[in-house]
């Protein structure tokens, strides 16, 4: 029994709803009474949602899942996952049993955009070329972990003396703090770019020291 799911991961923003697509091809004369559908977490086999004995057996996953009952008879076994959380990320298996078996796994990739970075200087006054300054770039509430890039006013990457830390909060979202220690040149513009690798979203800010 061939069960089809998308090859690419399903990308869902935190807090939105996601559809994990799954389909099978019913034989002529198929009725829902013959169907046993099980959605489960691939790694642990924890039950997520099921359909059996001709009826929806309900969500076993924090009551945030639903099937598409009107589409099941046509072979649409997709699962709706509501209010996506970071903890939902992973692989879900769609298992279909009608006389014979079929299954396929679909990956859910969770994402959250990073906020526009805020920048702080230390020290923040009486600065001259040749002084060493610490610039902190902070961006919040993103997922997954960010990539951070620094550059000067000419667009030249600054890679030395950069320390980046990322801390997850209780929701699993990351706050990013990147510190650049630099000796001030004549051109005092410094840019920080925070990239979400899944969303291909760039959040950036710059500071000009005069």
């Amino acid at each position: 029994l061939e069960v089809q799911v998308p090859e690419d991961p399903v990308v869902a923003l935190v807090g939105t709803d996601a559809t994990l697509c799954c389909s099978f091809s019913p034989e002529p004369g198929f009725s829902l009474a013959q169907l046993n559908l099980i959605w489960q977490l691939t790694d642990t086999k924890q039950l997520v949602h099921s359909f059996a004995e001709g009826q929806d057996q309900g969500s076993a996953y924090a009551n945030r899942t639903a099937l598409f009952p009107d589409l099941l008879a046509q072979g649409n076994a997709s699962l709706r996952l509501q209010r996506v959380r970071v903890a939902d990320e992973g692989s879900f298996t769609c298992f279909v049993s009608i006389r014979d078996f079929g299954s396929a796994a679909v990956s859910l990739q969770v994402a959250a955009p990073y906020s526009k970075p805020s920048m702080t200087l230390e020290p923040n006054k009486d600065l001259r070329p040749g002084d060493t300054v610490t610039i902190t770039c902070s961006s919040y509430q993103g997922y997954p972990e960010a990539e951070v890039f620094w550059q000067d006013g000419q667009g030249v990457p600054l890679t030395g003396n950069v320390t980046t830390s990322q801390m997850a909060n209780e929701q699993g979202l990351f706050d990013v703090h990147s510190i650049l220690r630099v000796v001030l040149g004549a051109n005092g513009t410094y840019s920080c770019l925070v990239r979400n690798p899944v969303l291909q979203q760039d959040a950036h800010s710059s500071v000009t020291i005069t």
């Epitope: 029994l1 046993n36 004995e53 299954s103």
Partner: antibody, heavy 114, light 107 residues
Framework: EVQLEESGGGLVQPGGSMKLSCVVS????????MNWVRQSPEKGLEWVAE??????????HYAESVKGRFTISRDDSKSSVYLQMNNLRAEDTGIYYC?????WGQGTLVSVSA | DIVLTQTTASLAASVGETVTITCRAS??????LAWYQQKQGKSPQLLIY???SLEDGVPSRFSGSGSGTQYSMKINSMQPEDTATYFC?????????FGGGTKLEIK
């Protein structure tokens, strides 16, 4: 009409090898997981191996007792499934059935004896 | 591994009698239970799948029920041709496992 026909059974000495074949007709072979199951008076019905679909990357699963000795394979163009059995033991003796979970062949007898 | 237990190894019933055969799983198998009939010298034949769906061509006197870990198959009015061994099998997880079988004979 669905038909599954096994072949390749027979008498083999312990440590020997044997390859079973099963040709299927009457359903779209490429869409079905295929299995080998064996039966003996001592152990009853015992699942041996399974091979899934191309879309499952032809994933295979084996009973612990045959892991490393038996290999299941399929040829969708020939609607056939195979079981290569190496290093056979007396306890591998039995009737070997190929099935798609729902539909079964008539079986082929494998006897491992000195 | 999931263990399937058919507690009754053999039983005899009169023609017309109702027969119930049970199968207990060692863990929840979420309805992925099939029942097979095997007559002497023949290969197993599917009777019931997904715990309660009757295979095409199987007489309506056969029925299946159950959920979780407890399943049963009922023959509403035993017929001489029902003399056979009946096996349950779970398809929830590999290794797939079978019950030990229940041999049903005519009294």
């Amino acid at each position: 009409e669905v038909q599954l026909e096994e072949s390749g059974g027979g008498l083999v000495q312990p440590g020997g090898s044997m390859k079973l074949s099963c040709v299927v007709s009457g359903f779209t072979f490429r869409n079905y997981w295929m299995n080998w199951v064996r039966q003996s008076p001592e152990k009853g019905l015992e699942w041996v191996a399974e091979i899934r679909l191309k879309s499952n990357n032809y994933a295979t699963h084996y009973a612990e007792s045959v892991k490393g000795r038996f290999t299941i394979s399929r040829d969708d163009s020939k609607s056939s499934v195979y079981l290569q059995m190496n290093n056979l033991r007396a306890e591998d003796t039995g009737i070997y059935y190929c099935n798609s979970h729902a539909d079964w062949g008539q079986g082929t007898l494998v006897s491992v004896s000195a | 591994d999931i263990v399937l237990t058919q507690t009754t190894a053999s039983l005899a019933a009169s023609v017309g009698e109702t027969v119930t055969i049970t199968c207990r799983a060692s863990e929840n198998i979420y309805y992925t239970l099939a029942w097979y009939q095997q007559k002497q010298g023949k290969s197993p034949q599917l009777l019931i799948y997904n715990a309660n769906s009757l295979e095409d061509g199987v007489p309506s006197r056969f029925s299946g029920s159950g959920s979780g870990t407890q399943y049963s198959m009922k023959i509403n009015s035993m017929q001489p041709e029902d003399t056979a061994t009946y096996f349950c099998k779970q398809g929830y997880d590999v290794p797939y496992t079978f019950g030990g079988g229940t041999k049903l004979e005519i009294k």
